[in-house]
């Protein structure tokens, strides 16, 4: 009862966490405008891992995807990586523990079956996890080297006339949603490797003991016992691998220069 | 059409509080801010503040401690409120909707007050 | 706050000659988000409201004549009427959309010759 509860809340909270790690890499909100200590503008610039957006107090928004490749930092395409490699392993983590939950019969699919199905994708919710929170602290690390940078010549004056006020980038949303969301990956991950000890099937058998009483000829035959030890020699771990995601942007738009965080 | 109506009081006493209301159609304010702004006769506008669709606002930091804008998205009316009036403060009195690169897009046809005892 | 100076103050033409009027502004206005700059150029004749004819310093308010073209950018902004009219007799201001307070220059009155 205990495994089976320990692997459907692995299984919600994965799914939970995928779902974060989804909402984040999709979000704009990866860098928002730092508006302390900084003159007020009627404008709010923020950043995404795929465009970058501009409000106006008027409340007309616009947004322009970041239409290169090559253009972009290489921080930048490393973090997209890492989150895509994130969900793909995390939506294969979710199918194949959809086979494995206990509370589902597929055919006459043994324990041991489950038990493997589990402890995959434990293990791939485990690494999606720290993909997302990877992705996010390379993100957030880029941005507070910048911050400081930025604040160094916060205004670069021209000819000693005119000053050219630079925007300045700090945490948005998405940071914390994509930490947290990895963290709850990470979690379910932990709870689904638990899981599978549980649903491990005993193998060991203890030989049936011939006992000799005096005087009579009666035999103890004790049933075949199983023991906890573990996993079975028949236990096989199966690997699987990310064939490699790629994302392109297909909507063309103006070209734009994207002062990127 | 977008269409801004200014209604208020021509005339006001020194240390007096004016009133003006800027009724608007053609439009919502729950999706457009509106602005205020004056006119000195024979001189240059100038931006008192701003209340925006979501409901906040901004102020001139010069005129802040007596400057109030509200708004009735029901009744689609918008009120600016100055306290302690100088002669200094006789100017026109315009409301205009917000647009594009936050221009002032329509303009009321403006409210002129005379600060006068 | 951001000044607005424009220039000159007042210019005395003849109707179809080609206009150009400065504004400069104490800081950029350009938004490095979207490159854009928030500079926005009103036409007010007496005794009416302003009328707005340029925001994001060259993009044209729809039903404004394409005589009236406004270029610039960052600090220095320029309106230009190709051929002036005589009802394009007024005072131009342009203003800051940028840096709260929203700013306007003192103007440049047109008249005519």
């Known amino acids: 009862m205990a495994v089976t509860a320990c692997q459907g809340l692995g299984f919600v909270v994965s799914l939970i966490g995928i779902a974060g790690i989804i909402a984040a890499t999709c979000m704009d909100q990866w860098s928002t405008q730092d508006l302390y200590n900084n003159p007020v503008t009627a404008v709010f610039n923020y950043q995404g891992l795929w465009r970058s957006c501009v409000r106006e107090s008027s409340g007309f928004t616009e947004c322009r995807g970041y239409f290169t490749l090559l253009g972009l930092p290489a921080m930048l395409q490393a973090v997209r990586a890492l989150m895509i490699v994130g969900i793909v392993l995390g939506a294969i983590g979710l199918l194949v523990s959809i086979f494995a939950l206990k509370c589902i019969r597929i055919g006459s699919m043994e324990d041991s079956a489950k038990a493997n199905m589990t402890l995959t994708s434990g293990i791939m919710f485990i690494v999606s996890g720290l993909c997302a929170i990877a992705g996010v602290s390379v993100f957030a690390n880029m941005l507070v080297t910048n911050f400081w940078m930025s604040t160094a010549n916060m205004y670069t004056g021209m000819g000693g006339m005119v000053q050219t006020v630079q925007t300045r980038y700090t945490f948005g949303a998405a940071l914390f949603v994509g930490w947290v969301a990895g963290g709850l990956t990470l979690i379910g991950g932990v709870m689904m490797c638990i899981a599978c000890r549980g649903l491990a099937p005993e193998e060991t058998n203890y030989k049936a003991v011939s006992y000799h009483a005096s005087g009579h000829s009666v035999a103890y035959k004790p049933g075949g016992f199983k023991a906890s030890t573990g996993f079975g020699s028949n236990t096989k771990n199966k690997k699987i691998y990310d064939g490699g995601a790629r994302t392109e942007d297909e909507v063309q738009s103006y070209p734009s220069k994207h002062d990127y965080v | 059409q977008v269409q801004l109506q200014q209604s208020g009081p021509g005339l006001v006493a020194p240390s007096q509080s004016l009133s003006i209301t800027c009724t608007v159609s053609?439009?919502?304010?729950?999706?457009?801010?509106v602005s205020w702004i004056r006119q000195p006769p024979g001189k240059g506008l100038e931006w008192l503040g701003a209340?925006?669709?979501?409901?906040?606002?901004n102020y001139n930091s010069a005129l802040m401690s007596r400057l109030s804008i509200r708004k009735d998205n029901s009744k689609s009316q918008v009120f600016l409120k100055m306290n302690s009036l100088q002669t200094d403060d006789t100017a026109m009195y315009y409301c205009?909707?917000?647009?594009?690169?936050?221009?002032?897009?329509?303009w009321g046809q403006g409210t002129l007050v005379t600060v006068s005892a | 706050d951001i000044v607005m100076t424009q220039s000159p103050s007042s210019l005395t033409v003849t109707a179809g000659e080609k206009v150009t009027m400065s504004c400069k502004s104490s800081?950029?206005?350009?938004?490095?988000?979207?490159?854009?700059?928030?500079l926005t150029w009103y036409q007010q004749k007496p005794g009416r409201p302003p009328k707005l004819l340029i925001y994001?310093?060259?993009t044209r308010e729809s039903g404004v004549p394409d005589r009236f073209t406004g270029s610039g950018s960052g600090t220095d902004f320029t309106l230009t009427i190709s051929s002036v009219q005589a009802e394009d007799l007024a005072v131009y201001y342009c203003?800051?959309?940028?840096?709260?307070?929203?700013?306007f220059g003192a103007g440049t009155k047109l008249e005519l010759k």
């Open positions: 800081q950029s206005l350009l938004n490095s988000g979207n490159l854009r700059n928030y």
């Open positions: 205009a909707r917000v647009g594009y690169g936050n221009s002032f897009a329509n």
């Open positions: 209340i925006w669709a979501g409901g906040n606002t």
């Open positions: 203003q800051n959309n940028y840096f709260y307070p929203l700013t």
């Open positions: 053609g439009f919502s304010l729950t999706n457009y801010g």
């Open positions: 994001w310093a060259s």
